[in-house]
């Protein structure tokens, strides 16, 4: 059992809206019928997440780019490395929610 | 547009089942009627996440502890620091899914 308490400013700074690593499950549909399995079956990308100081605000990306990553596509009789492109967020902002 | 491709080994290593920082929204219900707002309204904790090499496996915690953190409870007329305890995962494992 952890005795130490995480101080409020640290709790706040870590929780606020910022790019953070999230796990994205991969969809086999993207690959067509030939592929039996993707390895890995999920990937990690940087996406905006966390909370904003005010209920009227939401955490949105203001800088994004595509990241390309190699994925192993298990097929029969052979398997091959494929490439996948996913959106990654590099900058975030707390913006007023759209009415 | 990013030209570089993340190599498969790196994609695989980052995606596998391991403790990772996740955002947990805080519930006001925990606090009773007196509290008007919690700051921050979410916190980050380490939780098991990612994927396992096989569909028959799931990512589960094998080591956990409670982490205590300071949360600001906004009340009227005054506000005060409170403490919250959440479960954090320190070790994870890919285990056969329960039937």
């Amino acid at each position: 059992h952890q005795k130490k308490v995480v101080p409020w400013i640290d709790v706040y700074a870590r929780a606020t809206c910022q790019p953070r690593e999230v796990v994205v499950p991969l969809s086999m549909e993207l690959m067509g019928n030939v592929v039996k399995q993707l390895v890995p079956s999920c990937v990690t990308v940087q996406r905006c997440g966390g909370c904003c100081p005010d209920d009227g605000l939401e955490c949105v990306p203001t800088g994004q780019h595509q990241v390309r990553m190699q994925i192993l596509m298990i097929q029969y009789p052979s398997s091959q490395l494929g490439e996948m492109s996913l959106e990654e967020h590099s900058q975030c902002e707390c913006r007023p929610k759209k009415k | 547009h990013q030209k570089k491709v993340v190599p498969w080994i790196d994609v695989y290593a980052r995606a596998t089942c391991q403790p990772r920082e996740v955002v947990v929204p805080l519930s006001m219900e925990l606090m009773g009627n007196v509290v008007k707002q919690l700051v921050p309204s979410c916190v980050t904790v380490q939780r098991c996440g990612g994927c396992c090499p096989d569909d028959g496996l799931e990512c589960v915690p094998t080591g956990q502890h409670q982490v205590r953190m300071q949360i600001l409870m906004i009340q009227y007329p005054s506000s005060q620091l409170g403490e919250m305890s959440l479960e954090e995962h320190s070790q994870c494992e890919c285990r056969p899914k329960k039937k």
């Epitope: 400013i9 910022q18 605000l57 913006r95 | 906004i74």
Partner: antibody, heavy 119, light 106 residues
């Protein structure tokens, strides 16, 4: 690594205006409030105002309402303090600093900008 | 405005001593008080907030206590690098700093 980088020293004439900048880096600009604080030699610290970049709200110390104007540019994560109708009383070091929402505790400060008002 | 009064403008101490600085609020501020250290030519540095929470990276010889109107900041086992100005701040109603810092000197 959080940084608040302020503009350099200013020497201005009485009656003129000046704009001091504070460039934030190392965190999401719209998640913390930006405050401005005045320090005159041997006179302690005076809070001027805060600015919240997320919804552009401001709150001024009554004493500085007619003296100071706070603005920001979200695209460059920069905050600005404009001081008008300058007198020798405005000669001081001006700090920008940030705080979380609601608990106005200043965890990071700029290096300070020295303003000298003299003819 | 809430006035924060630091009674001592100067406090003399020696390395290894324990020293306490007090701050009195003109009205109840709950626990919304912070303490800062400032060295000549530098920006202030946050030490304590919410009256008793030590900021990350601040040595545990620095402690704060109090609530309502009376607050105390203590340095146990004073080190030579602790010689500086110290001031309190309330953020319960608007924001005000201690009227004049307390200078810690050898």
């Amino acid at each position: 690594q959080v940084q608040l980088q302020q503009s350099g020293p200013e020497l201005v004439k009485p009656g003129a205006s000046v704009r001091i900048s504070c460039k934030a880096s190392g965190y999401t600009f719209t998640t913390f409030y930006i405050h401005w604080v005045k320090q005159r030699p041997g006179q302690g610290l005076e809070w001027i105002a805060w600015f919240y970049p997320g919804n552009v709200n401001t709150n001024y110390n009554e004493k500085f309402k007619d003296k100071a104007t706070l603005t920001a540019d979200k695209s460059s994560s920069a905050a600005y303090l404009q001081l008008n109708s300058l007198t020798s009383e405005d000669s001081a070091v001006y700090f920008c600093t940030r705080s979380p929402y609601y608990g106005y505790v200043f965890d990071f400060w700029g290096q300070g900008t020295t303003l000298t008002v003299s003819s | 405005d809430i006035v924060m009064t630091q009674s001592h403008k100067f406090m003399s101490t020696s390395v290894g001593d324990r020293v306490s600085i007090t701050c009195k609020a003109s009205q109840d501020v709950g626990s919304a008080v912070a303490w800062y250290q400032q060295k000549p030519g530098q920006s202030p540095k946050l030490l304590i907030y919410w009256a008793s929470t030590r900021h990350t990276g601040v040595p545990d010889r620095f402690t704060g206590s109090g609530s309502g109107t009376d607050f105390t900041f203590t340095i146990s086992n004073v080190q030579s690098e602790d010689l500086a100005d110290y001031f309190c701040q309330q953020y319960s109603s608007s924001l005000t700093f201690g009227a004049g810092a307390t200078k810690l000197e050898l």
